[in-house]
Interface confidence: low
């Protein structure tokens, strides 16, 4: 059987939701000694990076300028050490946002509810779309989808303190092209600690797990530098 290297990890730097015309950055974390990394888009070769020096770096960044709907979709990456190629990474969905229009998000029965109450979010967008998405800030990987012509509802069921936080919605023109985000709606669940909108388990900045933590070999130790990335609070 053909020998392959372990699959790399693909991540979006900062976020996988990129406003149109902005730059997207994807990180491919493979192995020290990899001489070439390839970024694939919808199954086809999109870009190539060759780290220098390869033995000192365990991954690369791919910069995708001028984000638009043609560049939104499924990305993966592979790497090569000598003549040996890795398995393909998992797929990463890169989304372009700020397309066309802005939806309105509301919550019923209201933004201040009691633990155990049933809550429903409503996302409304007057331009033609059929899919709506609801995201909780700091939890943007947990996307809820709902369908409707102009408005979609997101029933949350009986809420607990884990539901508190700030929510936004998007209209989706296809899986990878989303509207501008709605204004945030803050859900407060009575019984929570005073004046707190984010659950204690929420990260202090959104999508912190999407940060590119590439490492540089510095002699005897690995320096866990954030490699020209600055976390935003």
């Amino acid at each position: 059987p053909k020998q392959t290297l372990p699959k790399p990890i693909i991540r979006a730097e900062s976020t996988y939701m990129v406003p149109k015309e902005k730059q997207a950055t994807l990180c491919c974390q493979g192995s020290y000694g990899a001489v070439e990394y390839q970024l694939h888009f919808e199954g086809s070769l999109f870009a190539v990076e060759r780290p220098k020096p390869p033995e000192r770096i365990n991954g690369v960044k791919f910069h995708i300028p001028d984000m638009n709907s043609r560049k939104a979709g499924r990305y993966s990456c592979i790497y090569r050490v000598g003549e040996l190629w890795s398995e393909r990474s998992d797929l990463l969905d890169l989304v372009v946002t700020e397309m066309y229009d802005t939806p309105t998000l509301s919550v019923h029965p209201g933004p201040e509810v009691t633990s155990g109450e049933k809550v429903t979010f409503y996302c409304r967008l007057d331009t033609a779309t059929s899919m709506f998405l609801l995201l909780k800030e700091g939890r943007s990987r947990d996307v809820q989808r709902s369908y409707g012509k102009v408005q979609a509802e997101f029933p949350m069921g009986p809420v607990t303190t884990a539901h508190r936080g700030s929510y936004r919605c998007f209209g989706s023109y296809n899986n990878y092209a989303w509207s501008f985000p709605s204004e945030p709606v803050k859900l407060l669940v009575t019984g929570d600690i005073e004046n707190t909108s984010l659950a204690p388990t929420d990260p202090t900045f959104p999508d912190s797990w999407d940060t590119c933590l590439l490492t540089r070999e510095t002699g005897l130790q690995k320096d866990l530098a954030l490699w020209d990335h600055t976390a935003q609070n």
């Epitope: 009691t114 429903t120 407060l188 005073e194």
Partner: antibody, heavy 116, light 107 residues
Framework: QVQLVQSGAEVKKPGSSVKVSCKAS????????MHWVRQAPGQGLEWIGG????????SYNQKFKGRATITADKSTSTAYMELSSLRSEDTAVYYC?????????WGQGTTVTVSS | EIVMTQSPATLSVSPGERATLSCRAS??????LHWYQQKPGQAPRLLIK???QSISGIPARFSGSGSGTDFTLTISSLEPEDFAVYYC?????????FGQGTKLEIK
Amino acid sequence: QVQLVQSGAEVKKPGSSVKVSCKASGYTFSEYTMHWVRQAPGQGLEWIGGISPNIGGTSYNQKFKGRATITADKSTSTAYMELSSLRSEDTAVYYCARRGGSFDYWGQGTTVTVSS
Amino acid sequence: EIVMTQSPATLSVSPGERATLSCRASQSISDYLHWYQQKPGQAPRLLIKYASQSISGIPARFSGSGSGTDFTLTISSLEPEDFAVYYCQNGHSFPLTFGQGTKLEIK
């Protein structure tokens, strides 16, 4: 058991204010919103507004905004509803009600009579 | 605001018979609909929450159904103590609104 005990009946002159209290017991006061509903003689129920004692957030029926003020004192587990610029049509029974989605517990009601 | 309309205004039924009360919302409220019973000189009492969920301590003869804009409260076999005024309530959107009430009287 859950109990909501309201203050006694009031007779007020037009233009004056009234403040009705509602003392809660039998549950954690800060975990439920407290609302006020009124009922004029022979009429139906009308929502005035509510408060989240935990965060102090209030929500009002637009009809009463500016005239009604709802407050809560967590230390005494008491909610208050003050209605100003009273007129004869404010004559009603005023109820406090705990809201856990629905109004699951109600006070006994406070009769407010506005008469010159 | 969401307007709640109850019908009929008065319903005359004999004890032991079935009573059906209706409530209509001016726009969809999913199942955020609650029913209350009120007797003269008393505060309202919660009977049914979220259109069909029963309440502890409320007799099983009271049941609710409906979703969206049309809702029904059914009392399967009327007892003398059931004659009262019944209100439906929108729990979906602020301002919270009530129907005008249905008076259930003895025939």
